[in-house]
């Protein structure tokens, strides 16, 4: 008795494919050892055809694969383009030799089935339309035409030229002739369902002089495409259902026993389990669309189906496309926080992992929006301007070689709560979803800047101080000047560093920055923050206005700008989102379902940046106290 299990007998026809699953006991050794598929010879020797070590025999080249699923304790052998020569005895097994643990499989490949003479075979997927061609002689040109379906010895009429239609084919079958053709009629059957499969006979005329044609209709459920994805990575279902359903509502659903539960559709329905991590993107006017799901979980594995129907729900007899998604738990994508919490007026530092082999890729951060299909406009990127409404409070810090970049958002408001995506223009699997939860602040922020009304005068010296609590004593403190392409670290002076950590005086922990002399280009947002190595922590922001000595009125009212830093009024947040919408064309990389689109967004952002203000940090120098 072998502990390996699989199908004992597999039968198919020439040209078809088989997918043979072998089950093995769930042990660590079994999960990692070699898997093989070999053909049993008359001499008792079993010749390897394919193995998990990468071996592929000549006769299987280009038509076979072996995939191990350690989390399911199975491996699958896929063999395509079968011929009768593939008939034989095989073994699927585990071990370094072909004598280890195995299971015997008999494969029989027969010829395509024989049908009565003149039988035309039609193979169609569920939901599609078949056009059956019926030839007749001139003598029957004016005779009754019909199509019937064989049921045992009887043949039940489906449709005829007297306008009779069998009720089960109502609104689905039509009989017609094309142009001036006098020797052929056609029957269209649309919205095909499995029970339509069978042998049909079309007939012109009656009695012995009647012309008859046989048609064998095979109605297939679409072969699911197998998708193998890593835990925490992303998957894109590309759905192309054809022009005939271009104007119908589209959906993606997940098979659950006999039902298929809709995950998302174009009518606004969305499964809460996919909130924040799904996008449906129309591709063109021919009904093509794609659905992207990020942050894959173990429970996302299963059978998916996309389809189209005016109700946005699965409907028998409408075209579908199918996938089987496997989620590999041995993932290369690191586990990162899926929920980040912040408080109003505070800040968050979000670490976004990316493929370390692609350190030069463009990095982005976008805000998932729950409109009907979901969308994710870019808020910031390594070569993308920060979206309006986020100036002075959002920056992306790339850390080449570390396999991660950090996005900092400060001056938080409750409207910042929601889902955000980290993504790059490189490996599309590395897309992570973060839920940001912003609660009302109940205490003073950890970092405080003085003076809060920061107006500097050109030519003079201006010092600004950032007060930090003792818990940040050992961390690196920094000041940076925010610009559209990041926040550039400035020289600064840590007043508290001279004290010993034992006698930390809460009131005198200060890091200050001095502008000497103040220049016009010093105007803008400045951040005070703490970090430990590459790990960024709390930040706070202040707007420094710069005015001429002679003039009394600053360029921007600093009180207004800094009021926003403390708590943005609702009107302003609403205005921001409107402006963000207007700006979307600049930076929204078509919802990232297509990698080229992200690249385009990057290119365009690069172009914008070249013509914009790079935010020079010149003219700032540290205090030399």
């Amino acid at each position: 008795q072998s502990p390996i299990f699989g199908p004992q007998d597999v039968s198919s026809i020439e040209g078809n494919s088989v997918s043979i699953t072998c089950y093995y006991p769930d042990t660590s050794v079994n999960r990692h050892t070699r898997k093989y598929w070999c053909r049993q010879g008359a001499n008792g020797y079993c010749a390897t055809l394919i193995s998990s070590n990468g071996y592929l025999s000549k006769e299987y080249s280009g038509r076979a694969s072996l995939i191990n699923f350690p989390e399911n304790s199975t491996f699958v052998i896929n063999i395509a383009h079968l011929t009768q020569e593939d008939t034989g005895s095989y073994k699927c097994g585990l071990g370094t030799t072909n004598r280890g643990l195995f299971f015997d499989v008999s494969l029989e490949v027969s010829q395509v089935p024989e049908f009565p003479n003149d039988t035309h075979v039609y193979t169609k997927d569920i939901g599609r339309t078949v056009t059956i061609e019926c030839r007749f002689k001139e003598g029957n040109a004016h005779s009754k035409k019909s199509l019937c379906k064989k049921r045992g010895e009887a043949c039940e009429v489906v449709i005829d030229s007297t306008e009779y239609v069998d009720p089960s084919y109502k609104d689905r079958a039509i009989l017609f002739m094309k142009g001036t053709s006098r020797d052929i009629f056609y029957v269209n059957i649309s919205h095909l369902i499995p029970s339509d499969a069978g042998l049909y006979v079309c007939q012109a005329g009656e009695g012995p002089s009647a012309d008859k044609n046989n048609a064998d209709l095979q109605v297939l459920e679409p072969e699911p495409e197998l998708l193998y994805k890593d835990l925490r990575s992303s998957v894109t279902f590309e759905c192309d259902l054809g022009r005939e359903v271009a104007n119908d509502a589209k959906y993606l659903c997940r098979k659950n026993k006999e039902t298929c539960d809709v995950i998302i559709n174009t009518l606004g329905k969305r499964d809460p389990a996919f909130e924040g991590r799904i996008l449906l993107t129309p591709r063109d006017d021919n009904g093509r669309f794609s659905v992207l799901i990020t942050g894959l979980r173990k429970e996302d594995a299963g059978h998916y189906q996309c389809g189209a129907h005016s109700s946005g729900l699965p409907q028998e007899g409408w075209p579908v496309q199918a996938w089987q998604l496997f989620v590999n738990e041995e993932s290369t994508i690191p586990n990162s926080r899926s929920v980040v919490k912040g408080v109003t007026g505070g800040s968050v530092a979000i670490v976004c992992p990316y493929n370390p082999k692609e350190s030069s890729s463009l990095k982005y951060w976008c805000h998932w929006e729950a409109d009907e299909n979901g969308r994710c406009p870019v808020l910031v990127g390594t070569q993308a301007l920060v979206q309006e409404g986020y100036e002075g409070r959002l920056a992306l810090f790339d850390q080449p070689g570390s396999g991660a970049y950090t996005v900092i958002l400060n001056q938080l408001t409750t409207q910042d709560s929601g889902f955000y995506w980290c993504l790059t223009d490189g490996d599309s699997r590395w897309r992570t979803t973060i839920e940001l939860q912003v609660a009302e602040a109940t205490k003073k922020p950890d970092l405080e800047v003085t003076p809060q009304n920061a107006t500097a005068v050109i030519g003079e010296t201006f010092t600004i101080s950032c007060h930090y609590p003792c818990k940040f004593y050992s961390q690196e403190k920094y000041w940076c000047k925010w610009s559209n392409d990041g926040c550039h670290i400035l020289p600064s002076h840590d007043e508290g560093a001279r004290q010993s950590s034992v006698s930390c005086d809460q009131s005198s922990q200060i890091v200050s920055m001095t502008l000497n002399p103040v220049k016009k280009e010093d105007e803008g947002w400045y951040w005070c923050g703490v970090k430990e190595g590459q790990v960024y922590g709390e930040t706070t922001a202040i707007y420094v206005a710069v005015e001429e000595r002679t003039r009394g009125s600053p360029h921007i009212n600093p009180t207004d700008a800094n009021a926003r830093a403390k708590d943005a009024p609702e009107e302003e947040a609403m205005e921001s989102s409107v402006r963000e919408d207007e700006n979307k064309a600049n930076l929204d990389p078509r919802l990232f379902a297509d990698e080229r689109e992200i690249q385009n967004a990057g290119d365009q952002a690069q172009e914008n940046r070249a013509s914009g203000n790079a935010g020079s940090a010149g003219g700032q120098s540290g205090s030399s106290k």
Epitope: F5, P7, Q8, D9, V10, S11, S12, I13, N16, S17, V18, I20, T21, Y23, N72, T74, P113, I126, I193, P194, S195, A197, Q218, V219, L220, E221, P222, E223, P224, K255, K257, E258, H303, Q305, A322, Q324
Partner: nanobody, 129 residues
Amino acid sequence: QVQLVESGGGLVQAGGSLRLSCAASGRAFSSGRMGWFRQAPGKEREFVAAISWSGHTTYKYYADSVKGRFTISRENAKNTVSLQMNSLKPEDTAVYYCAARQSLVAGGDPRGQSEYDYWGQGTLVTVSS
């Protein structure tokens, strides 16, 4: 909804043969899986055989205890699955249940009862010595 009706059970002598049939009414399956399980008195229900299909491709699975003696087959047009049982032994005595799964894909391990969506009422097979 799919209903499964088993037939063909009865009393047979050891070494004899029986043919069980399971008819599925309702929707035609263009792909899916049907299987036979059995439950002997005082024992748990166990896997006997299964057949999966999609288009013209068929996969047949058997429990070690019935290999070479039982044969599972499917009649497409009638939506029925049969289990031909030869060389019957007294330990084959049990209630035999038919199970079905209607899916785009054959699914997981055919030996698992959770893999099936529909079940018949069962038919009793008694093998006397």
